[in-house]
């Protein structure tokens, strides 16, 4: 794991809203050179969010993670302020970056120094969402849509950076947004291009100008405070790539905003999740549109374009 960089590689202009510490496995401060101080939180789904270090919930979360890390260390764990399982994912994961986040890969091509260090299984999962986020989501409308992969944490709005890929060179790209009325804003996530001489497994792709998305897809996270509890399930487009910074996530009670995810996960032998309409309860989430990403490995750029999918919003009553 390479950490030797003082240059600011994660810039946060927008902070996430609250996330249960049960869903967090790790945190780190951004570099002093970034100017605006922020805490980078990693969820059990290996999604990264910017958080304001002055907020009490962030202080409490860090303290909690410190205690867990200390307990793990006493038990022979080797985590760096990281709790929870960090094992290769067998299901597609989606990661996103906040509209206000700028990732600048280090010279090694790493998008950030948040690559998890695998350890014992029990120490490897802390989140309790849902593997990463809750698995079944229920909202005030009572419908449960098809679930999204575990690798997706429900997260605050507009503050997710990207998903840290646990030991894999395959990337799964998916855009996702909260079930919330009204258009979802998508902001550009800018990163500097990584040198073309780097090893493919450590290349960092840059996310470029995603188009604004009116009905961004849900990732299965509950839109905090909205009262919806869908169990959505998005089909993911897989691309052979290394770790990739992604777009912003927006969650209602985790903060309003727009969200686009670009996730990096191991290629699953199970393939993409089926988009089976399965909902129950009485929550009725809004329609979703999956975002498909196209990648040019030569440019290491990622263009995310919305592709409407009529199936995505299917509900089971």
């Amino acid at each position: 794991q390479h950490h030797g960089v003082t240059k600011c590689n994660i810039t946060c202009s927008k902070m996430t809203s609250k996330i249960p510490v049960a869903l967090l496995i790790h945190y780190q401060q951004n570099q002093a050179s970034c100017g605006k101080r922020a805490i980078i939180l990693e969820t059990r789904q290996h999604r990264l969010f910017c958080a304001d270090p002055k907020e009490q919930w962030v202080k409490d979360a860090m303290q909690h993670l410190d205690r867990q890390a200390a307990a793990l260390t006493r038990n022979g764990g080797t985590f760096e302020k990281q709790i929870g399982e960090v094992k290769p994912r067998t299901t597609p994961a989606a990661g996103g970056m906040d509209e206000s986040v700028v990732l600048e890969p280090e010279a090694t091509g790493e998008s950030s120094s948040l690559e998890p260090t695998p350890s014992s299984q029990e120490a490897q999962r802390a989140l309790g969402t849902s593997p990463e986020l809750p698995t079944g989501v229920t909202g005030s409308s009572g419908t449960r849509l098809p679930p999204t992969p575990k690798a997706q944490d429900g997260g605050p709005v507009g503050t997710e950076l990207f998903r840290v890929p646990p030991v894999s060179t395959a990337a799964t790209w998916q855009s996702s947004a909260p079930h919330q009325p009204g258009p979802s804003l998508w902001a550009e996530a800018k990163t500097s291009e990584a040198p073309s001489t780097q090893d493919p497994s450590t290349q960092a792709s840059t996310a470029s100008s995603p188009a604004p998305e009116e009905n961004a897809p849900s990732e299965g996270q509950r839109v905090w405070g909205q009262g919806q509890s869908p169990r959505p399930e998005n089909s993911l487009e897989r691309e052979e790539m290394g770790p990739v910074p992604a777009h912003t996530d927006a969650f209602q009670d985790w903060g309003p905003g727009s969200m686009a995810h670009v996730s990096v996960v191991p290629v699953s032998s199970e393939g993409t999740p089926s988009r089976e309409p399965v909902a129950s309860g009485s929550w009725t989430p809004k329609a979703e549109e999956p975002i498909h990403a196209t990648m040019d490995p030569q440019r290491l750029g990622v263009l995310i374009t919305p592709v409407p999918d009529a199936q995505a919003a299917t509900r089971r009553q």
Epitope: P20, T90, P131, P134, T135
Partner: antibody, heavy 119, light 107 residues
């Protein structure tokens, strides 16, 4: 419609083990956590732990470590909880439940499996 | 671990009355609180999450509030179907913990 169907009541002797099941339907089983909750007669609820069927990884309440084994069978959409070295303290109703991925609260519950440990 | 203390342990009320159940956490749970209702011999039913957001199908006479360590569930104009046991649950940190329950009985 999301449903969690649990196995029937169990009467076992102290020291024995028991394995109860929770069959999920109405949603993609591998995408959501399954939690287990214990309720002793006339008492409150205790969270035992969860399993993520997608990769089989569990997390436990420390109080139940060593006592409990959580597994999941993706082919049958079924989660299992094995309780070992049973004592009368383990006599309770055990619920499986599932929740969203943005926070571990439980929007769907099984009907419960009653375990009676008695010689 | 965060302990959840519910009060009162039981209360009697008449149909049409308003009651309030409180839940105190031993630490700040940052509004990550859920409420459930359980009827005799049944599994718990999900009512509220994130301290105040009603689950689907839950009547508007139910309302949640609170912050930090103190939370409450208020039921206006009690209906016959509202009687049962109510539990709070924090999902800020693991292990997730529940309150001891409040038994709401018909007077």
């Amino acid at each position: 419609q999301v449903q969690l169907q649990q196995s029937g009541p169990e009467l076992v002797k102290p020291g024995a083990s028991v394995k109860m099941s929770c069959k999920a339907s109405g949603y993609t089983f591998t995408n959501y956590y399954i939690h287990w909750v214990k309720q002793r007669p006339g008492q409150g609820l205790e969270w035992i732990g969860w399993i993520y069927p997608g990769d089989g990884s569990p997390k436990f309440n420390e109080r139940f470590k060593g006592k409990t084994t959580l597994t999941a069978d993706k082919s049958s959409n079924t989660a299992y909880m094995l309780l070992s070295s049973l004592t009368s303290e383990d006599s309770a109703i055990y619920f499986c439940a599932t929740g969203p991925t943005d926070g571990d609260y439980f929007d769907y519950w099984g009907q419960g499996t009653t375990l009676t440990v008695s010689s | 671990d965060i302990q959840m203390t519910q009060s009162p342990a039981s209360l009697s009320a008449s149909v049409g009355e308003t009651v309030t159940i409180t839940c105190r956490a031993s630490g700040n749970i940052h509004n990550f609180l859920a409420w459930y209702q359980q009827k005799q011999g049944k599994s718990p039913q999900f009512l509220v999450y994130n301290e105040k957001t009603l689950a689907d199908g839950v009547p508007s006479r139910f309302s949640g509030s609170g912050s930090g360590t103190q939370y409450s569930l208020k039921i206006n104009s009690l209906q016959p179907e509202d009687f049962g046991i109510y539990f709070c649950q924090q999902f800020w940190s693991t292990p997730y913990t529940f309150g001891g329950g409040t038994k709401l009985e018909i007077k």
